[in-house]
Interface confidence: low
Amino acid sequence: LLDTRQFLIYNEDHKRCVDAVSPSAVQTAACNQDAESQKFRWVSESQIMSVAFKLCLGVPSKTDWVAITLYACDSKSEFQKWECKNDTLLGIKGEDLFFNYGNRQEKNIMLYKGSGLWSRWKIYGTTDNLCSRGYEAMYTLLGNANGATCAFPFKFENKWYADCTSAGRSDGWLWCGTTTDYDTDKLFGYCPLKFEGSESLWNKDPLTSVSYQINSKSALTWHQARKSCQQQNAELLSITEIHEQTYLTGLTSSLTSGLWIGLNSLSFNSGWQWSDRSPFRYLNWLPGSPSAEPGKSCVSLNPGKNAKWENLECVQKLGYICKKGNTTLNSFVIPSESDVPTHCPSQWWPYAGHCYKIHRDEKKIQRDALTTCRKEGGDLTSIHTIEELDFIISQLGYEPNDELWIGLNDIKIQMYFEWSDGTPVTFTKWLRGEPSHENNRQEDCVVMKGKDGYWADRGCEWPLGYICKMKSRSQGPEIVEVEKGCRKGWKKHHFYCYMIGHTLSTFAEANQTCNNENAYLTTIEDRYEQAFLTSFVGLRPEKYFWTGLSDIQTKGTFQWTIEEEVRFTHWNSDMPGRKPGCVAMRTGIAGGLWDVLKCDEKAKFVCKHWAEGVTHPPKPTT
């Protein structure tokens, strides 16, 4: 059976696969997924290994018309470095010389300057080029190699291993060499995989059942450390509760060097955030941190300084802490908008069982704003999801130059932010450089400001506008209001009407359904339309909703189904990558973000059309 990293190298024109007959004869044969000799995999960014021989594809020289054969894998050799060129060409790195079969009656695979059909290769059974099954470095744990990556294949007791092994151990622990020759270098680490006993690499907090892994002997950059945690279905540490900080202070007390945690300000337009999307509501900075120096966007926990946090450049090499298991957040169910009949007094706006109102003109200090909201039967608004935030931005009449009090504050416990309405903190969205909590000005209250409505801490004594929120009164079945310019069941936003397609459909079926309704799969023109759509679908239980974006027409170029330019994108992390396909909006914790899916997957969808009676504004000229 093929493991997910292995593939057969297929030429569509010959309908044949590469076959390593022997180390000196790399030829082709009828494709057979059970043949070890046809299985290959990437073992570094640029090396391809034969699974059967545990040797790497290479050439004797970078010249035209030399045989491609198998060599002992050497990550430093220029003659074993391959790259995917445009589309499905595979070539030797840095040269216009390609992996080729079929010219001049040659049985062997050759390096050749021609870039025709006989130099084009795909992963057998897919339309993808070989790089789509690329190499993912595996960072080791413990051992003696400072968390270095596994070197595959590696030699142990004169035998080659292309995977982690428990060879030489009686306890089944999986390990790998971190250099090609373990026998000589004796460098190794344990693999970030599940195996009998791997649980003992973790420390479980008995109070919360959350597990922590302290990798104090490693030396990785922040991004590498994060990858290492993710390889274990975990994330870099987030700390949202004082108890959690206390537990970790104890766990790291015998250490001295800094350890990466998940806190970062890597997002271009927002502030401090945890990599696992936990809310940033508890602050434990070292005095003088966070320093505003550019580039210091990642955070370490300092065991030698009472486990306080310091921002550093992300390329520094440190140990790190991973976290997995039940989140420390209280479970807090946010009702889906569609589940809740929402009736609100005049001038209040309904959303997901609550009513909201912006008080822009009567400026008040935070304490008085809170009193006013409570007199009206509500509280300063709490915000629990990106959908709720996007509702406020897109449908409450929020303006880019607003600065409005919300209910978040750390008045009760310094450096521990809570909502004034007592609901748990499940979500935060700080502005870049926030929360700054400048000590010379006690900044205990929080405002929403700027075009995106992100948050900043502020001295509570400033007179500002504010947003109130209250529970809606349920009054029997909801009256479905027909919005002006839209048909029944459609929702209006600015110049357009939108409808959720409730039948699970492929991209093509969804597109056809929208067309039948004299509409089209939704386009998304800007941040505000995205905010509206996020609030429209984001709390629903289904995972995905099709948009009209795909690269069906031209692979690698994403276009809307209607002739409209792509002027705005909202990709999820690692998207669009190299995957061809159709684009759907996520719901849940990644609410609104765009993922590329296979076009024949089934999902719900959003249709869109011009509202009736709206004058079309002129198309922007580019």
Partner: nanobody, 119 residues
Framework: DVQLVESGGGSVQPGGSLRLSCAAS????????KAWFRQAPGKEREEVAA???????NYADSVKGRFTISRDNAKNTVYLQMNSLKPEDTAVYYC?????????????WGQGTLVTVSS
Amino acid sequence: DVQLVESGGGSVQPGGSLRLSCAASARIFSSYHKAWFRQAPGKEREEVAAITSGGSTNYADSVKGRFTISRDNAKNTVYLQMNSLKPEDTAVYYCKAVVVTTTPYSDYWGQGTLVTVSS
């Protein structure tokens, strides 16, 4: 090299208690993962309880709530307190230590101590 010596085994009636000790010859015992295993006649060796170098503990479902693993770094010793013993706990109990920072294959076993539970 590390030597592990178990003690504390013996015969006991169902419902009784025993405390097993495992003393190590090496001073660096605290940087090892320690575990107690057992092997009943005709059965495979199974892990009963483990304590990590960080102090976390894990137990097999069959002994949860009855057995407690602990360690005393100053004495280079790990203990297994066994309460509410049952006949099915009868086995040879082995202590094991895994060094997690040297070569891939340095784990050490004791010789075993016999525990018999019968009326």
